[in-house]
């Protein structure tokens, strides 16, 4: 028993960020005369939250009217709570002293815990594109949550991934926390339409996790396959040669025709067709005037895709036979086709 006790009935209080915290405190006596003060923390570095005697505390209101006669309820409300407000709050009775007021009795303290929602997860992929069969890393970050417990999962097209590492910082006590996770994803040729999803679950989200996404279309590069074919004769002394550029992504592509190593024409892919998997096809053709050549002609379709080293495919066009005697099939059969990749 004591002549005055300061009672803080709540050992802990849990409040969502943005809400108002009520910290309860009553005194068993008004004697000795002196003010009540609220502090966050203990010891010399404690922070004054409210002083009954004097001061301006815009976020703090008293639950009771402290000017009311013989009031012994010194509970306070703190508005617009943020994670930075977390800590242990002490209701302290002072007695008048000479010259300064003297701390008389302290309550046992109320620990204020703040529940703060994590920020929307931000997923970022590699800086440079990568090709199928390569492994790329994706990172996911979310900040500002409290308490520390949090769950993070990775998905690719709805399938949960297992190859990832996650860290929550800081390791020790803090007002709020951040999560950082890195997942490894193996690319396939079909990934243009794929999505990588980072899913964060936290107590503040009430079972409705937050998701961040990254489209693999921003990460993948599918190199084209080339096919050069000789088409039936279109007119006397003319042969139509086509270069089929298939299954490439992204669309940025430049094609150059070479006749016996000399640039004949350069063009940029424009009117492309899109495949179901999101890759593109494109065709370029070259009309070769056979009569202009005495010897066989080596036609090369050279493709530079998305700033990568050029890929090419060649087709040998024999001019010894009379073009008008060649059928569409025999023309193709009578010409050899060499495939050559230049890196």
């Amino acid at each position: 028993e004591e002549e005055l006790q300061v009672i803080q009935p709540d050992k802990s209080v849990l409040v969502a960020a943005g809400e108002t915290a009520t910290l309860r405190c009553t005194a068993t006596s008004l004697i000795p005369v002196g003010p009540i003060q609220w502090f966050r923390g203990a010891g010399p570095g404690r922070e004054l939250i409210y002083n009954q005697k004097e001061g301006h505390f815009p976020r703090v209101t008293t639950v009771s009217d402290l000017t009311k006669r013989n009031n012994m309820d010194f509970s306070i409300r703190i508005g617009n709570i943020t994670p930075a407000d977390a800590g242990t709050y002490y209701c302290v009775k002072f007695r008048k002293g000479s010259p300064d007021d003297v701390e008389f009795k302290s309550g046992a303290g109320t620990e204020l815990s703040v529940r703060a929602k994590p920020s929307a997860p931000v997923v970022s992929g590699p800086a440079a594109r990568a090709t199928p069969q390569h492994t790329v890393s994706f990172t996911c970050e979310s900040h500002g949550f409290s308490p520390r417990d949090i769950t993070l999962k990775w998905f690719k097209n709805g399938n949960e991934l297992s190859d990832f590492q996650t860290n929550v910082d800081p390791v020790g006590e803090s007002v709020s926390y951040s999560i950082h996770s890195t997942a490894k994803v193996v690319l396939t040729r079909e990934d243009v339409h794929s999505q990588v999803i980072c899913e964060v679950a936290h107590v503040t989200l009430q079972g409705d996790p937050l998701r961040g996404t990254a489209n693999l279309s921003e990460t993948i590069r599918v190199p084209p396959t080339l096919e050069v074919t000789q088409q039936p004769v279109r007119a006397e002394n003319q042969v139509n040669v086509t270069c089929q550029v298939r299954k490439f992504y992204p669309q940025r592509l430049q094609l150059t025709w070479l006749e016996n190593g000399n640039v004949s024409r350069t063009e940029t892919a424009s009117t492309v067709t899109e495949n179901k998997d999101g890759t593109y096809n494109w065709m370029s053709w070259l009309l070769v005037n056979v009569s202009a050549h005495r010897d066989d002609v080596k036609l090369t379709c050279q493709v530079e895709h998305d700033g990568q080293p050029a890929v090419s495919k060649s087709h040998d066009l024999k001019v010894s036979a009379h073009p008008k005697e060649q059928g569409s099939n025999t023309a193709a059969e009578n010409t050899g086709s060499n495939e050559r990749n230049i890196y």
Partner: antibody, heavy 114, light 111 residues
Framework: QVQLQESGPGLVKPSQTLSLTCTVS????????VNWIRQPPGKGLEWIGI???????DYNAALKSRVTISKDTSKNQVFLKLSSVTAADTAVYYC????????WGQGTTVTVSS | DIVLTQSPASLAVSPGQRATITCRAS??????????MHWYQQKPGQPPKPLIY???NLESGVPARFSGSGSGTDFTLTINPVEANDAANYYC?????????FGGGTKVEIK
């Protein structure tokens, strides 16, 4: 139940130091303060000072230079020392519990005389 | 120091009548919504007995015939109805400022 009992010499010579003891029961000296009050014969009450539960003290400025209040918590005793006494210090001396002075001892009479 | 002036210095009251004692402080004894003024009864050869604390609150075991009122500098102790057993000296006391002080006392006699 709560009790306070003053004790000490009934006669003190002028210029000497008056020493009194207040022995308490029914409450803890760490939880409650104890006051000393005196009452000269036929006169009113005068507050001398208080020792709080934490051991800190507050004194009447008129007597502060001559007064010391201390305590021995383990023995449940509070002590008053008043130095350089004169006949004007002749009084009944009371100890009373806490800032509220809700319980009083019966008092002890101290006469200052040669 | 806060000086407490009690009046009257003495009064004689018949049993069943009302006795009113006033205590005027030289400065306010109010702080933080309370008046730190208290009243004591002292009979000859006995220590003071607490009657009223914080101007108007009855101490445990004190008959409801006793009541206190007032704030700031002016306070009143009322005994209604007075009984023969109420003959005593009555003191007001403040502990709002150091040094804590008592009034000079009022002697109540029963006719």
């Amino acid at each position: 139940q709560v009790q306070l009992q003053e004790s000490g010499p009934g006669l003190v010579k002028p210029s000497q130091t008056l020493s009194l003891t207040c022995t308490v029961s029914g409450f803890s000296l760490t939880g409650y303060g104890v006051n000393w009050i005196r009452q000269p014969p036929g006169k009113g009450l005068e507050w001398i000072g208080i020792i709080w539960g934490d051991g800190s003290t507050d004194y009447n400025a008129a007597l502060k230079s001559r007064v010391t209040i201390s305590k021995d918590t383990s023995k449940n005793q509070v002590f008053l020392k008043l130095s350089s006494v004169t006949a004007a210090d002749t009084a009944v001396y009371y100890c009373a519990r806490a800032g509220k002075m809700d319980y009083w001892g019966q008092g002890t009479t101290v006469t200052v005389s040669s | 120091d806060i000086v407490l002036t009690q009046s009257p210095a003495s009064l004689a009251v018949s049993p069943g009548q009302r006795a009113t004692i006033t205590c005027r402080a030289s400065e306010s004894v109010d702080s933080y919504g309370s008046s730190f003024m208290h009243w004591y009864q002292q009979k000859p050869g006995q220590p003071p007995k607490p009657l009223i604390y914080l101007a108007s609150n009855l101490e445990s075991g004190v008959p409801a015939r006793f009541s206190g009122s007032g704030s700031g500098t002016d306070f009143t102790l009322t005994i209604n109805p007075v009984e023969a057993n109420d003959a005593a000296n009555y003191y007001c006391q403040q502990n709002n400022e150091y040094p804590w002080t008592f009034g000079g006392g009022t002697k109540v006699e029963i006719k």
